[in-house]
């Protein structure tokens, strides 16, 4: 027999299957060109001195063999005596150590046995009822396939799985989805219903993230508020990177975890937009307002758990920057303007009350007045800061009020609302003899003293009822006592105290009469 032909004679070894565990297996035969065919197989066991024979039986019952020698792959043409148009049965017999080992048989029509392509192009990945669904377009003119997948994690070897038979222009596969680790998948195809057909190559890796994106483990710090009324939010610790399987390292589309920063500005609730979402890499500047910050991790399956922080408001106050004038029509605030066409947000809340009770007002964009000041006015009827109590005021500014990260703090200060002159009047003024020509005057602290920076000073007035002479004595806002000296015995005096702010003179307390008794010597 010629080596290129299938030999229709008895093979040159005895016909007896040893039934040993070793031997040829996994025979695959397919068409490799218009007129050529190839069969390949695996051999389990020691290969020294093994001769392989590819056996073939035609539908007529006639059988032949090709001698492959030590090779486990053999090619032949459509002229080799094997009927390619009709079904044939093929198997391998390996002669080794004076015994014959046989592979399982495959029955196929060689003509139609073409090697399939793996899934090509875009493999779409989605989540379906806790499983992974992969879908791809069937390679052209290869409808009708068996599909297998293999998958691995960073710490586990390949595991094989079955997608089942496919018979459409699109093919799909349901695969296991891991909760917390990334996976690499590969797919392969072979002709449906042809037991000896050859598997395609494995597809390119499909990299799949875990169902749950990793929780971000990050830490922030906030810088001091700068001269421009803004402070930088900085990331102290980058989020941990997801561990990837071998084939997904480097460029691994599909496994990316994106971290987004969600800012919620709690102060100034009357502004248009309270929240903004940014990429974590782009750390923003913030005003001195209070914020809630969340870092949200997400992958192609959606968002995961987030981490949240509260950034408290910067409470550094500027006691002199705000001027307030109270007139008959209402109240006007003045402060140094930031720039042209700025929108300001004025926020106030009673001191010692929950931050949720803050009230605010948004101005229309305004330019500085000739003195370089910005203003905000309100009428008494509006009720704004109308109660006689201490308010904490913060003013924010922005040229783009719709952009959350472009607000800056102009100033923070305290203001006593309502009729501060009257409300601030000191009560419980008392006079005690101190010496032969002096007295000690005491009073209860003014309500204004509860408002940091508002009370500029106390003024104590002493009036000589005989001569009608008046003397005034300034007293530090932290003091509630003064000694009046140089007084004459037997003279009637009245004493009054008032509390002044930077922009308002207080109302005198009720006059308190006293005199120093004349000392009679024995």
């Amino acid at each position: 027999c010629r080596t290129s032909e299938c030999c229709f004679q008895d093979p040159p070894y005895p016909d007896a299957d040893s039934g040993s565990a070793s031997g040829p297996r996994d025979l695959r035969c397919y068409r490799i060109s218009s007129d050529r065919y190839e069969c390949s197989w695996q051999y389990e066991g020691p290969t020294a001195g093994v001769s392989h024979f590819l056996r073939c039986c035609l539908s007529s019952g006639r059988c032949c063999y090709f001698a492959a020698g030590s090779a486990t792959r053999l090619q032949f043409s459509d002229q080799a005596g094997v009927s390619v148009l009709y079904t044939v049965t093929l198997w391998v017999e390996s002669w080794a150590r004076n015994q014959t080992e046989k592979s399982p048989e495959v029955t196929l029509q060689l003509y139609n046995s073409v090697k399939y392509e793996p899934p090509l192009g875009d493999i779409k990945v989605s989540k379906l009822a806790g499983q992974l669904r992969m879908e791809w377009e069937t390679p052209d003119n290869q409808v009708g396939a068996e599909v297998q997948f293999r998958h691995r994690t960073p710490s586990s070897p390949w595991k094989l799985g079955d997608c089942g038979p496919q018979d459409d222009d699109t093919e799909s596969c349901l695969c296991p989805l891991e909760m917390n680790v990334a996976q690499e998948f590969q797919l392969r195809r072979r002709q449906l219903g042809s037991q000896g057909s050859s598997w395609s190559k494995w597809s390119s890796p499909v990299c799949v993230p875990p169902e749950n994106p990793p929780q971000p483990q990050v830490r922030f710090s906030v810088e001091q508020l700068g001269q421009d009324g803004r402070r930088r939010l900085t990331l102290k610790e980058q989020p941990t990177q997801l561990e990837l399987p071998e084939g997904c390292q480097g460029l691994a589309p599909g496994t990316e975890v994106t971290y987004r920063l969600q800012l919620h500005m709690l102060s100034c609730p009357c502004k248009a937009k309270a929240t903004r979402t940014l990429h974590l890499g782009k750390m923003p500047y913030l005003s001195g307002a209070a914020y809630n910050v969340a870092v949200i991790s997400s992958n192609q399956f959606g968002p995961g758990l987030n981490q949240t922080w509260h950034i408290p408001a910067d409470t550094h106050t500027e006691p002199v920057a705000l001027n307030i004038s109270v007139g008959t029509n209402g109240t006007t605030m003045y402060w140094p303007a930031r720039a042209q066409s700025m929108t300001y947000c004025i926020e106030w809340q009673p001191v010692g009350q929950d931050g949720g009770l803050a009230t605010c007002s948004l101005t229309a964009p305004q330019d500085p007045d000739p003195a370089g000041m910005a203003t905000y006015s309100w009428s008494r009827e509006s009720g704004a800061m109308g109660q006689e109590k201490c308010y904490y005021i913060t003013i924010f500014a922005s040229a783009h009020p719709e952009k959350l990260t472009l607000w800056s703090t102009v100033l923070s200060t305290y203001h006593f609302g309502g009729n501060a002159s009257a409300a601030g009047t000191p009560h419980h003024v008392s006079v005690k003899n101190h010496s032969l020509d002096s007295v000690s005057v005491d009073w209860a602290p003014s309500l204004l003293s509860t408002c940091p920076g508002v009370l500029k000073e106390y003024v104590v007035r002493c009036r000589d009822e005989d001569s009608k002479q008046v003397s005034e004595h300034p007293v530090q806002p932290t003091e509630t006592q003064v000694t009046l000296s140089g007084l004459r015995a037997g003279v009637a005096y009245t004493v009054q105290v008032r509390a002044d702010t930077a922009w308002l003179r207080g109302v005198w307390s009720q006059p308190q009469r006293f005199s120093i008794e004349v000392q009679v010597s024995d």
Epitope: R31, Y86, Y111, V114, E117, T138, D140, N141, G144, D169
Partner: nanobody
Framework: EVQLVESGGGLVQTGGSLRLSCAAS????????MGWFRQTPGKEREFVGE??????????ADSVKGRFTISRANAKNTITMYLQMHSLKSEDSAVYYC??????????????????WGQGTQVTVSS
């Protein structure tokens, strides 16, 4: 569904050449192979040749081997199969039909393996 339309038939001298085309449209990705058959009056359709579309593998009847060549061109949703005929003989005169199959079982030479057929185009070889 798949639609097949043949073109290119006509009258040609003995020894001449002719190229037939078959345009397939519709659900073309599901076709695995396309073939040419021919028929003369009063006789059964005779296999000429076939091409496996995904690989371009061809197979010919002995009567045309070496003279006829089948090729194909793929575009989006259409496939065109060609039959290039050289050294034509009078016995090549027939109506030539284009056929398509969607299954991998069966031999190419049997008409019953093909689900789709064209209307046919006449080829006349005159001496």
């Amino acid at each position: 569904e798949v639609q097949l339309v043949e073109s290119g038939g006509g009258l040609v001298q003995t020894g001449g050449s002719l190229r037939l085309s078959c345009a397939a449209s519709g659900r073309t990705p599901s076709i695995v192979a396309m073939g040419w058959f021919r028929q003369t009056p009063g006789k059964e359709r005779e296999f000429v040749g076939e091409i496996i579309l995904s690989k371009g593998f061809t197979y010919y009847a002995d009567s045309v081997k070496g003279r006829f060549t089948i090729s194909r061109a793929n575009a989006k949703n259409t496939i065109t199969m060609y039959l290039q005929m050289h050294s034509l003989k009078s016995e090549d005169s027939a109506v030539y039909y284009c056929a398509a199959r969607q299954n991998w079982s069966g031999g190419p030479t049997r008409t019953n393996e093909y689900e789709y057929w064209g209307q046919g185009t006449q080829v006349t070889v005159s001496s």
